[in-house]
Interface confidence: low
């Protein structure tokens, strides 16, 4: 349906309060090193101006496509040139190359430093002084930090964080209130955030193929009882809504995924059981209920899969008819049996499918050839199950800081042109799928965990891609999203790396490291062990673990002697140099 | 739909060069990994090279590196494969394809749209 004016369309349809805090995301992500109060001023005036053209259509450029109205907001910001170089070339440009080349410059690693919560009787002041400007500058510094952030999901996030302080800002202790419940929810805007970089780049590095195929296998294991024809419609939508999303369009994408919402509430007895609870709720919080809601119960007269799929005699003439539509039938079929693979996994197996049909198509007799195809997933299915358990064994004989170090020695081992700021976060990114998957029971631990290290890969090959220095990166990113786990797990030591110079200065520690919080402190030491590893990558284990060890008793002494820094200047170079003697 | 037609085949000596050309029509060129495949007579079809849509990532036979580049134009859908140094192994019927979503670029069966082919035939 064509709207007179798209803006004024968009404004009734989200209501004022979403509509100004999707603008003021929108320009947070496209322009990150604005301050808060050009950002406030610019998502002001445009939804001042969405409200006039929604009380009169056909006012002055009331008319104009979002991207003309955003685009010429953003070319009025002064400061462009100086703060963003190239980027103020944009503005030369036309639509849609205009908002192409903005999407372009959106900078996945910023640099900001993490933000600090001032003390609490400041926040609550400032909270209870002011709750639309605090909520907006939650707003903007979660979207100028994640570029890619779900712009609906941080709407309802900031409906969270002012819950929080409503409640704490009452409490007799504040920052005991407030400590855990922040931290709680800051855990889950980075994984979040982290969940949506996937999606965008699935949508954006592989097609809407790629991102359809996840979907349906990912919602055919929550609602199982749905048809395919159910799911195929949903997976169409939230195809479109992500691709909305990810390509900077948060309006359309706020107000789809709202009605996409509204289309699974009223059609909840062909999808889910499970979803009453979630329709009750208001906008946010239904489309943010629907996301998370639990897996409904497998039918119980289902089929084998071999009689559509093996032995079938019209198998290949299926196939080939509609070749899509029935491997989009497999994939349903396949994982709604299956709840306990992976996505990923689900995906290979439909992989693996398609390549057996195309083979035995073509043979003179295809039955034969694909007879057993089912059963030669075995070996894809014994893979990451054989991962997950090897694994998690080695997490729960390390804890959560050893088995981040000893993720950290292999991938520091298989990619050591990787930067070590990247390969330290993304390692203490993987590490952590130990404390998130290993203590669920087996039936969930390796979808949990495979799906979880899709998304902190793709964290790596983000970051990669901005500044590539490793062919077999570059490899593993690129050639298959279903199989950039496997790809990065079958890395071996990359014998062509020629070992990095001996730098005195990153191996130089001050005083000032007995100060800082448990997490930083484990940072800095796993950051001198990447070093270590670059500049002697054929140190073994037990070497490393004796260095490592030597290092973690250096700083307690230090960090409690009278004469700290004094400590950390003398006993430091010994302790390098018995390292280098240690990993001759 | 997409519509792929190559160009540029022909008889060569070894050592000769040849630039093949595929234009694109149907569809948004930008958007698909293109790939040249060949096959000789009597044997199977085999890739040869892929690019992916924004020309970052190309991919190449072991038989063919270094003697072969793959480019695309996307302003004018048109993906090349530029053939130096060629030998009498190389003579085959040289492909286009086009693909929405690849897992892996070197499987022909990826590939969702091919051209018709152009001939190469290397000879003395």
């Known amino acids: 349906e064509a709207y007179k004016s798209e803006i004024a369309h968009r404004y009734n349809d989200l209501g004022e309060e979403h509509f100004r805090g999707l603008v003021l995301v929108a320009f947070s992500q496209y322009l990150q090193q604005c301050p808060f109060e050009d950002h406030v001023k610019l998502a002001k005036e445009v939804t001042e101006f969405a409200k006039a053209c929604a009380a009169e259509e056909s006012g002055a450029n009331c008319d104009k496509s979002l991207h003309t109205l955003f685009g010429d907001k953003l070319c009025t910001v002064a400061s462009l040139r100086d703060k963003y170089g190239d980027m103020a070339d944009c503005c030369e440009k036309q639509e849609p190359d205009r908002n192409e080349c903005f999407l372009a410059h959106k900078d996945d690693n910023p640099g900001f430093p993490p933000l600090v919560a001032p003390e609490p009787d400041a926040l609550c002041a400032a909270f209870q002084d002011n709750e639309q400007l605090f909520l907006g500058k939650y707003l903007y510094e979660i979207a100028r930090r994640h570029p890619y952030f779900y712009a609906p999901e941080l709407l309802y996030y900031a409906q969270q964080y002012k819950g929080v302080f409503a409640e704490c800002c009452q409490a007799a202790d504040k920052a005991a209130c407030l400590g855990p419940k922040i931290e709680a929810l800051r855990e889950k805007v980075l994984l979040s955030s982290a969940k949506e970089r996937f999606k965008c780049a699935s949508l954006q590095k592989f097609g809407d193929r790629a991102f359809k195929a996840w979907s349906v296998a990912r919602l055919s294991q929550r609602f199982p009882k749905a048809d395919f024809a159910e799911i195929s419609k949903v997976v169409t939508d939230l195809t479109k809504v992500h691709k909305e999303c990810c390509h900077g369009d948060l309006l359309e994408c706020a107000d789809d995924r709202a009605d996409l919402a509204k289309y699974m509430c009223e059609n909840q007895d062909s999808i889910s059981t499970k979803l009453k609870e979630c329709c009750d709720k208001p906008v946010l919080e239904k489309s943010q209920c629907l996301a998370e809601v639990e897996r409904d119960e497998l039918p119980g007269d289902l089929p084998s899969l071999a009689a559509d799929f093996v032995e079938d005699k019209e198998v290949c003439k299926n196939y080939q008819e509609a070749k899509d539509v029935f491997l989009g039938t497999f994939l349903y079929e396949y994982a709604r049996r299956h709840p306990e693979y992976s996505v990923s996994l689900l995906l290979r197996l439909a992989k693996e499918y398609e390549a057996t049909l195309e083979k035995c198509c073509a043979t003179d007799d295809p039955p034969t050839c694909y007879a057993k195809v089912l059963d030669e997933f075995k070996p894809l299915v014994d893979e990451p199950q054989n991962l997950v358990k090897t694994n998690c064994e080695l997490f729960e004989k390390l804890g959560e800081y050893g088995f981040q170090n000893a993720l950290l020695v292999r991938y520091t081992k298989k990619a050591p042109q990787v930067s070590t700021p990247t390969l330290v976060e993304v390692s203490r990114k993987l590490g952590k799928v130990g404390t998130k998957c290993c203590k669920k029971p087996e039936s969930e631990r390796m979808s949990c965990a495979e799906d979880f290290l899709s998304v902190v890969l793709n964290r790596l090959c983000v970051l990669h891609e901005k500044t590539p220095v490793s062919e077999r990166v570059t490899k593993c990113c690129s050639e298959s999203l279903v199989n950039r786990r496997p790809c990065f797990s079958g890395l071996e030591v990359d014998e062509t790396y020629v070992p990095k110079e001996f730098n005195a200065e990153t191996f130089t520690f001050h005083a000032d490291l007995c100060t800082l919080p448990e997490a930083e402190k484990q940072v800095k030491k796993q950051t001198a062990l990447v070093e270590l590893l670059k500049h002697k990558p054929k140190a073994t284990d037990e070497q490393l673990k004796t260095v490592m060890g030597d290092f973690g008793a250096f700083v307690e002494k230090c960090c409690a002697a009278e004469n700290k820094e004094g400590c950390f200047s003398e006993e430091g170079p010994k302790l390098v140099a018995a390292a280098q003697a240690a990993l001759v | 739909e997409v519509q792929l037609v190559e160009s540029g085949g022909g008889v060569v000596q070894p050592g000769d060069s040849l630039r093949l050309s595929c234009a694109a029509s149907g569809g948004t060129f930008s958007t698909y990994v293109m790939g040249w495949f060949r096959q000789a007579p009597g044997k199977e079809r085999e890739f040869v090279s892929a690019?992916?849509?924004?020309?970052?990532?190309?991919y190449y036979a072991n038989s063919v590196k270094g003697r072969f580049t793959i480019s695309r134009d996307n302003s004018k859908n048109t993906v090349y494969l530029q053939l130096n140094s060629l030998r009498p192994e190389d003579t085959a019927l040289y492909y286009c394809?086009?693909?929405?979503?690849?897992?892996?670029?070197?499987?022909?069966?990826?590939?969702?749209?091919w051209g018709q082919g152009t001939l190469v035939t290397v000879s003395s």
């Open positions: 394809a086009a693909s929405r979503f690849t897992s892996w670029y070197t499987a022909d069966y990826e590939y969702d749209y």
């Open positions: 690019i992916s849509q924004n020309s970052i990532h190309t």
